[in-house]
């Protein structure tokens, strides 16, 4: 059975991740989660100390 | 076609200790999740855990109603994963399916069935 | 955890008749980056192991009837059997994944008339 591809890429995407559909991958921790469970950093504006909201993208099949 | 088939079930006491086995075929087993689910006579499906492939360490998550008791193992040379059960209860008493992660829970094995009763 | 509730608990239909079985989560499935709503149907046939049927809320397993489908957004969910076959004797099982630990419905048994 051929294992289908795991994301589509574009020219300036990011590589593709080692996660099964169901879940998505977490640019923080660098490991595959539950997309509810993402924790994905964004820059900070000056004096923010606050954490990262939780945003992410999941390659589809 | 890909296939399940668990086995190791059987009677045991409470308190004592079980491990369920997976063999699998059909696919390469180092590129995929694999999970546990179990499900008491006449009641309905509960997750149990499951573990990631290669690509991601064969890193486990697991339901915390079982979180400490069970394991999720593989043996990759032997295609074949398994459930570590400790410290059984009553209430462990269930048909327990390994199913194949995908999309969700792909495929499923035929199930074996543990009693837990003194 | 996410609870999943299924309704009704149980129906029975005669061969030829629709079917609709619902699936409410109590918090929302949809993951606005990709508009996937991560809710899965299974079918579980007696004595048998479950089967998927439907992941991604609408998309059908490759050898599905086409008489099943699944639909919905959100928290609110719908699997319906376009016409029923004798086959189709089965509890129905939603699962969402989400979130960990992935949870699943009661289930719905459907009976033939």
């Known amino acids: 059975m051929r294992r289908g591809p795991r994301s589509l890429r574009g020219r300036d995407a990011p590589a593709p991740t080692p996660c099964v559909p169901a879940e998505c991958f977490d640019l923080l921790v660098r490991h595959c989660v539950a997309c509810a469970l993402l924790r994905t950093p964004r820059p900070k504006p000056a004096g923010a100390s606050s954490p990262a909201p939780r945003t992410a993208l999941q390659p589809q099949e | 076609e890909v296939k399940l088939v668990e086995s190791g079930g059987g009677l045991v006491q409470p308190g004592g200790s079980l491990r369920l086995s997976c063999a699998i075929s059909g696919f390469t087993v180092t590129a995929y999740y694999m999970s546990w689910v179990r499900q008491p006579p006449g009641k309905a499906l509960e997750w149990l855990g499951f573990i990631r492939d290669k690509a991601n360490g064969y890193t486990t998550e697991y339901n915390p109603s079982v979180k400490g008791r069970f394991t999720i193992s593989r043996d990759n040379s032997q295609s074949i994963f398994y459930l570590q059960m400790n410290t059984l209860r009553a209430e462990d008493s269930a048909t327990y399916y390994c199913?194949?992660?995908?999309?969700?829970?792909?495929?499923w094995g035929q199930g074996t069935t543990v009693t837990v009763s003194a | 955890d996410i609870v999943m509730s299924q309704s009704p608990s149980s129906l029975a239909v005669s061969v030829g008749e629709k079917v609709t079985m619902s699936c409410k989560s109590s918090?929302?499935?949809?993951?606005?980056?990709?508009?996937?709503?991560?809710l899965a149907w299974y079918q579980q046939k007696p004595g048998q192991s479950p089967k998927l049927l439907i992941y991604w809320a609408s998309t059908r397993e490759s050898g599905v009837p086409d008489r099943f489908t699944g639909s919905g957004s959100g928290t609110d969910f719908t699997l319906t059997i376009s016409s029923v076959k004798a086959e189709d004797l089965a509890v129905y099982y939603c699962q969402q994944y989400y979130t960990y630990p992935y949870t699943f419905g009661g289930g719905t048994k459907l009976e033939i008339k």
């Open positions: 199913a194949q992660v995908r999309r969700a829970l792909d495929y």
């Open positions: 918090q929302s499935l949809l993951y606005s980056s990709n508009q996937n709503n991560y």
